[in-house]
């Protein structure tokens, strides 16, 4: 953390003071933003955004869909964030099934996790079909799975996000990749 000289505005403080928080489904989410110039809380996940003008964000009974990034902003435009995972064994993925890629570019399969501690977060072909051998990915539990350098041959590829939960493979809803040619 860079030191802030006196008189220079500083970002807000959030309690609990950690970058990630894991709560169980049904439990309370209670986030406190401490700043004399508090303006708002913003919640973001996938394409959803919500705002709250109270300095304490309370969700009494957390659901999987409360998983996301909570950002507190002050009057100087400075902000601080905490990412909350709401662990729900019945809903391991949040999904936005739109999946478009441009040839030779990366594209994001939007299936963020509600539990960051599951293992083997990866992609699987639909109905047990193999994925292309040259497909490569980078996982991000908060955003989804980035497919690297999409090939034209991937057009109409059907896939699922996949994790292992207690020794069993769990699949997300299916995604169909649409690829736009580079030229």
């Amino acid at each position: 953390q860079p030191s802030v000289s006196p008189g220079e505005p500083s970002p807000p403080s959030i309690h609990p003071g950690k970058s990630d928080l894991i709560v169980r489904v049904g439990d309370e989410i209670r986030l406190l933003c401490t700043d004399p110039g508090f303006v708002k809380w913003t919640f973001e996940i996938l394409d959803e955004t919500n705002e709250n003008k109270q300095n304490e964000w309370i969700t009494e009974k957390a659901e999987a869909t409360n998983t996301g990034k909570y950002t507190c902003t002050n009057k100087h435009g400075l902000s601080n964030s905490i990412y909350v995972f709401v662990r729900d064994p019945a809903k391991l993925f949040l999904v936005d099934r739109s999946l478009y890629g441009k040839e030779d570019n990366d594209t994001l399969v939007r299936c963020p996790l509600t539990d960051p501690e599951v293992t083997n977060y990866s992609l699987k072909g639909c109905q047990g079909k193999p994925l292309p051998k040259d497909l490569r990915f980078i996982p991000d539990p908060k955003a989804g799975i980035m497919i690297k350098s999409v090939k034209r041959a991937y057009h109409r590829l059907c896939l699922h996000c996949s994790v292992d939960q207690e020794g069993k493979s769990v699949l997300s809803e299916k995604f169909i990749l649409k690829v736009r040619p580079a030229f």
Epitope: T119, S122, K133, L135, R136, F137, P139, D140, K148
Partner: nanobody
Amino acid sequence: EVQLVESGGGLVRAGGSLRLSCAASGRTFTYDARAWFRQAPGKEREFVAAISWSGGSTYYPNSMKGRFTISRDNAKNTVYLQMNSLKPEDTAVYYCAADESFPAYYSDYALYRYWGQGTLVTVSS
């Protein structure tokens, strides 16, 4: 290019534990996929565990889950493999691998580009 150096191997009694380290140097910031494989004499190289450098997602075959744990220390640019309840059949040379991203078939050793020299683990009965 990335250089990988494994350490921590040695002789251990069955039921014991070891922690292997894989220190990376070079252009490591571009290499998100880090993995451990092992090769016993006369056998094919076998997937043990993997971790995503940026997001911390972990990968294991079912056979290794519970006994082996992969972790990372970003400040030291090092990946660890904690091995517990070791058995004589865990005897092998353990290799660290890296690549910019994970192959769809992340347990396939042929799909990783960068490798360390390996460290020998011997488990006696």
